[in-house]
């Protein structure tokens, strides 16, 4: 079977979609590698293949449906299989029992939008993309402002601790250049983690006003 | 620390069904990632199965062929293993163990990551 220095790892995003990487040492480049889905309460079943990503890494995304559909719920539990080409047969090299509702990785914020700009405020607003109707609002949000001369990892988080998809951002400076990203993350699962960071937008506030002649 | 008690092992013929039950005392059982091991006569002790924390991954070796479940319920303390299509080589004593560190349901798991063992339960499948 697989060692220690083999990995598996996959997420659902809530609807339609499970994505999955493979690592093992050692392995060769060109071996050609699947995920097999064979889900307990349904009629269907998915593959895809990896495609490798880096040295000893694979990845692959298993298309359940249509995206915006809901193909799992909370009591399935999907066997998922790493099969790799040895030969003429195909070799099974991990099997894993994944629930979707505790492995969530949701995709990332969309429609991120300027509302209202002013010299030291910005409000902005965003949307979510292919959520599962589960999560009602039992969502949470993440947001990170970028100021000139910063890079990203220094700029601080701003925590929403409730489906709230818009922020205002304050004591920002006159005439200046900034960039704005949000990720989200539902409030259940095991294994639930951060949404990858939404595309920067960029936005600049407006110039403080001339002061009158005296 | 918890302690195991494995039951539910017998004798049963070839292509037939056995559920094992792992039931744990005296400690926090949700903070412990848990594993299934078996070990044949004059063989070495072999990995069948590990669940998470909470579930929501389980590992399987892949001689189980998709033929074993592995599954916990945190409200009773008790980890299963539901064995079915049993084959002659499926004999061996089924070991329940209990692992304190983290572990993430991506990998398969050594004996030696597991600290705490249960006394075992003797499956014998019959041709």
């Known amino acids: 079977a697989v060692n220690g220095t083999s990995q598996f790892t996959c997420f659902y995003n809530s609807r339609a979609n499970i994505s999955c990487v493979w690592s093992q040492d050692g392995a060769l480049q060109d071996t050609s590698c699947q995920v097999h889905a064979w889900p307990d309460r349904r009629r269907w079943n998915q593959t895809c293949e990896l495609l490798p990503v880096s040295q000893a890494s694979w990845a692959c995304n298993l298309i359940l449906g249509a995206p915006d559909s809901q193909k799992l719920t909370t009591v399935d539990i999907v066997t998922l299989r790493v099969l790799c080409r040895e030969g003429v047969r195909w070799r099974v090299m991990a099997i894993q029992d994944f629930k979707p509702f505790e492995n969530l990785r949701l995709m990332a914020p969309i429609s991120l939008q300027v509302v209202h700009v002013e010299t030291h405020r910005c409000n902005i607003s965003w949307e979510i993309s292919q959520a599962s109707h589960y999560f009602e609002r039992h969502l949470e949000f993440e947001a990170r402002t970028l100021s000139p001369g910063h890079t990203w990892e220094e700029a601080p988080l701003l925590t929403l601790k409730q489906k709230q998809e818009w922020i205002c951002l304050e004591t920002l400076t006159p005439d200046t250049q900034y960039e704005f990203q949000v990720r989200v993350k539902p409030l259940q699962g095991e294994f639930t983690t951060w949404s990858p960071w939404s595309q920067p937008l960029a936005f600049r506030t407006k110039p403080a006003a001339l002061g009158k002649d005296t | 620390e918890v302690q195991l008690v494995e039951s539910g092992g017998g004798l049963v013929q070839a292509g037939g069904s056995l559920g094992l039950s792992c039931a744990a005392s005296?400690?926090?059982?949700?903070?412990?990632?848990m594993g299934w091991f078996r070990q044949a006569p004059g063989k070495e002790r072999e990995f069948v199965a590990a669940t998470t924390r909470g579930g929501g991954r389980t590992m399987y070796a892949v001689s189980t062929e998709g033929r074993f479940t592995c599954s916990r319920d945190n409200a009773k303390n008790t980890v299963y293993l539901q064995m079915n299509s049993l084959k002659p080589k499926d004999t061996a004593i089924y070991y329940c163990?209990?692992?304190?560190?983290?572990?993430?349901?991506?990998?398969?798991?050594?004996?030696?990551?597991?600290?705490?063992w249960g006394q075992g339960t003797q499956v014998t499948v019959s041709s």
């Open positions: 163990a209990a692992m304190t560190s983290y572990y993430s349901g991506t990998y398969y798991p050594d004996s030696s990551d597991f600290d705490i």
């Open positions: 005296g400690g926090t059982f949700s903070s412990y990632a």
